[in-house]
């Protein structure tokens, strides 16, 4: 069997709840990026998350080797009918995937959106958003995920995740 | 042109209807796995489904070579809404991707969910769920897809499918 | 660092608005393909879209090297709801991915669907559809995306895109 190990440039990082080392930094609401950056990713949960020739820093995957990467994320929005005055019944759930390069502002690579059910009879909502695409990245580029309505995200490791791998 | 063939470890298996060799086994409702396992996958429909250095057994893809795999599935839920005596039967449509290892219980890798429309005007629902992610798998690990509300799944080969490929 | 460049067979092409060189050709409504083919893809937007050992012709990615390809697309449907008397307001949003081979008719590889919200209270709809899968393609095969309700598609480059890469 051939040895593929050394060629591997890949990551799959997963949601985690309330871990003190992964709380949002004050800068998690980047004024130039839409939504709010997800910082609470876990990268070493056996059998579920890993980093291989990519680094994780402040919720961002940091590229070590230039090339074309398939980048993907899933975010699982979950909410219920709650008695709160002055709240619109509709929610826009948007997932953004950005990159930082040497250019100071983040660059939007992909966005995916859903709005919730408008019916007054709605009791709850379950909406997973997945997207992925191929992008050329350079050494030290950083990629991250941001979302609207971040308080609705279910950060179970099977439900919300972020990953990338080098293609070809 | 270089020869890539021998390096290929990949599969794309597709939904099939009522084929006797792919009907759910009595054990398709695994008590330790949420939902019901989909067994009715087809692996040799020309131009649509294939297995290359992966095996298919009882609806499960069986790993022949250890490594990081991008695993994905799409399931297409389709139904007529039935309003019975002013009761709305909201549907939670969840797709789970599990793996079996030497550990006796299946391990949940990914889950994606949608709920159906709450409006009383709803006549039918169309909901495709796609998810995918990177996971380290070992020889003889098995991966499978299970779903809630399996009777709602459209098992057309273009609509519901399951696949994996070795990365790097 | 090893040289991966020559091995790269990949593309990520992105939505574009009203560019004269990407307008639908008269044949974009292929009678044998469901939906309407999207022709307005951009392939050389720095940092966002590219072609590497694949060609783009009439909205179709043209294969240069046979092999197994992971093919994906995202289409972003966005619309205002219009309340018309006694008119059902439901929309079926379907994304199809087809291939052309030497066989004269296009062959459907994948389809993904959503219907819009039925509620009379609905004001607008946001629905991203992503799907992807692995398929064996031969030299000169062509792949394309078609959609129902194409006038609802948001062709921003981050929102709607189409891509493929050679696996293994």
């Amino acid at each position: 069997v051939r040895e593929r190990g050394p060629q591997r440039v890949a990551a799959h990082i997963t949601g985690t709840r309330g871990r003190s080392n992964t709380l949002s930094s004050p800068n998690s609401k980047n004024e130039k990026a839409l939504g709010r950056k997800i910082n609470s990713w876990e990268s070493s949960r056996s059998g579920h998350s890993f980093l291989s020739n990519l680094h994780l820093r402040n919720g961002e995957l940091v590229i070590q080797e230039k090339g074309f990467y398939y980048i993907y994320s899933q975010t699982y929005f979950r909410f219920q009918e709650e008695i709160k005055e002055n709240t619109k019944n509709d929610k826009q759930m948007v997932q953004y995937i950005y990159k930082y390069t040497s250019y100071p502002d983040p660059i939007l690579l992909m966005k995916s959106a859903r709005n919730s059910c408008w019916s007054k009879d709605a009791e709850y909502g379950l909406y997973s958003i997945y997207q992925g695409g191929l992008f050329e990245l350079k050494k030290d580029d950083r990629i991250f995920v941001s979302v609207t309505n971040e308080h609705l995200i279910d950060m179970d490791h099977e439900a919300s995740f972020f990953g990338a791998f080098l293609v070809g | 042109v270089r020869e890539r063939g021998p390096q290929r470890v990949a599969a794309h298996i597709t939904g099939t209807r009522g084929r006797s060799n792919t009907l759910s086994s009595p054990n398709s409702k695994n008590e330790k796995a949420l939902g019901r396992k989909i067994n009715s996958w087809e692996s040799s429909r020309s131009g649509h489904s294939f297995l290359s250095n992966l095996h298919l057994r009882n609806g499960e893809l069986v790993i022949q070579e250890k490594g990081f795999y991008y695993i994905y599935s799409q399931t297409y839920f389709r139904f007529q809404e039935e309003i019975k005596e002013n009761t709305k039967n909201d549907k939670q449509m969840v797709q789970y991707i599990y793996k079996y290892t030497s550990y006796p219980d299946p391990i949940l890798l990914m889950k994606s969910a949608r709920n159906s429309c709450w409006s009383k005007d709803a006549e039918y629902g169309l909901y495709s769920i796609y998810q995918g992610g990177l996971f380290e798998l070992k020889k003889d690990d098995r991966i499978f897809v299970s779903v809630t509300n399996e009777h709602l799944i459209d098992m057309d080969h273009e609509a519901s499918f399951f696949g994996a490929f070795l990365v790097g | 660092v090893r040289e991966r460049g020559p091995q790269r067979v990949a593309a990520h092409i992105t939505g574009t608005r009203g560019r004269s060189n990407t307008l639908s050709s008269p044949n974009s409504k292929n009678e044998k393909a469901l939906g309407r083919k999207i022709n307005s893809w951009e392939s050389s937007r720095s940092g966002h879209s590219f072609l590497s050992n694949l060609h783009l012709r009439n909205g179709e990615l043209v294969i240069q090297e046979k092999g197994f390809y992971y093919i994906y697309s995202q289409t972003y449907f966005r619309f205002q709801e219009e309340i018309k008397e006694n008119t059902k307001n439901d929309k079926q949003m379907v994304q199809y991915i087809y291939k052309y081979t030497s066989y004269p008719d296009p062959i459907l590889l994948m389809k993904s669907a959503r219907n819009s919200c039925w509620s009379k209270d609905a004001e607008y709809g946001l629905y991203s559809i992503y799907q992807g899968g692995l398929f064996e393609l031969k030299k000169d095969d062509r792949i394309f995306v078609s959609v129902t309700n194409e006038h609802l598609i948001d062709m921003d480059h981050e929102a709607s895109f189409f891509g493929a890469f050679l696996v293994g």
């Epitope: 709840r17 979950r78 909410f79 219920q80 009918e81 709650e82 008695i83 005055e85 019944n89 019916s119 007054k120 009879d121 709605a122 009791e123 709850y124 379950l126 279910d154 | 949420l34 939902g35 002013n86 009761t87 709305k88 909201d90 939670q92 969840v94 969910a113 709450w118 009383k120 809630t148 | -």
Partner: antibody, heavy 115, light 107 residues
């Protein structure tokens, strides 16, 4: 502040009927689903009925369907439970709760079915 | 119907103890589970919703968690006012179902 106040409980003979009311305040009543829950003496909580926010849907457990009817009057911010063909086993404290996930509860009203 | 199996049904503990109550769901409920506190003569109070979200005004010693189909209410350091009966409730589907309750008493 959300407030739910039940009324209408009391002593009733087996086979009789009773109508419970729940007066709601502190939120836009018509936007939210409402439920009735009961608790027999020394027993666990038991769900009785729910009506959706828009009033389109009503839900009951199978064992109460046909005997109990939930309704609402959004103009009066009121929820009702009509209970017919009452039995001794319907004896319980009846609570109204809002919304369908039962964030808020009333103090309850006692229904005693006895001859 | 979805069954909620709550355990233990009775718990004797001292002030300052860490207390754990579990609730197992027989089917997927997507985290739509809440924990309620009932004290004699008082209005029933919701403590936790969506499996792990603390209601406003509820002390931080209460927490909820989920592992698959098992849901847990934890009181990190039991206080005198916490002696009560606790119920889990699933609101993912109809019929709504409650756990059997856990009575927490002073040792």
């Amino acid at each position: 502040e959300v407030q739910l106040v039940e009324s209408g409980g009391g002593l009733v003979q087996p086979g009789g009927s009773l109508r419970l009311s729940c007066a709601a305040s502190g939120f836009t009543f018509s936007n939210y689903g409402m439920s009735w829950v009961r608790q027999a003496p020394g027993k666990r909580l038991e769900w009785v009925a729910t009506i959706s926010g828009g009033g389109s849907y009503t839900y009951y457990p199978d064992n109460l369907k046909g005997r109990f009817t939930i309704s609402r009057d959004n103009a009066k911010n009121s929820l009702y439970l009509q209970m017919n063909s009452l039995r001794a086993e319907d004896t319980a404290v009846y609570y109204c709760a809002a919304p369908t996930a039962m964030d808020y509860w009333g103090q309850g009203t006692l229904v005693t079915v006895s001859s | 119907d979805i069954q909620l199996t709550q355990s233990p049904s009775f718990l004797s503990a001292s002030v300052g103890d860490r207390v754990t109550i579990t609730c197992r769901a027989s089917q997927e409920i997507s985290g739509f589970l809440s924990w309620l506190q009932q004290k004699p003569g008082k209005t029933i109070k919701r403590l936790i919703y969506a499996a792990s979200t603390l209601d406003s005004g509820v002390p931080s010693r209460f927490s909820g968690s989920r592992s698959g189909s098992e849901y847990t209410l934890t009181i990190s350091s039991l206080q005198p006012e916490d002696f009560a009966t606790y119920y889990c409730l699933q609101y993912a589907s109809y019929p709504r179902t409650f756990g059997g309750g856990t009575k927490v008493e002073i040792k």
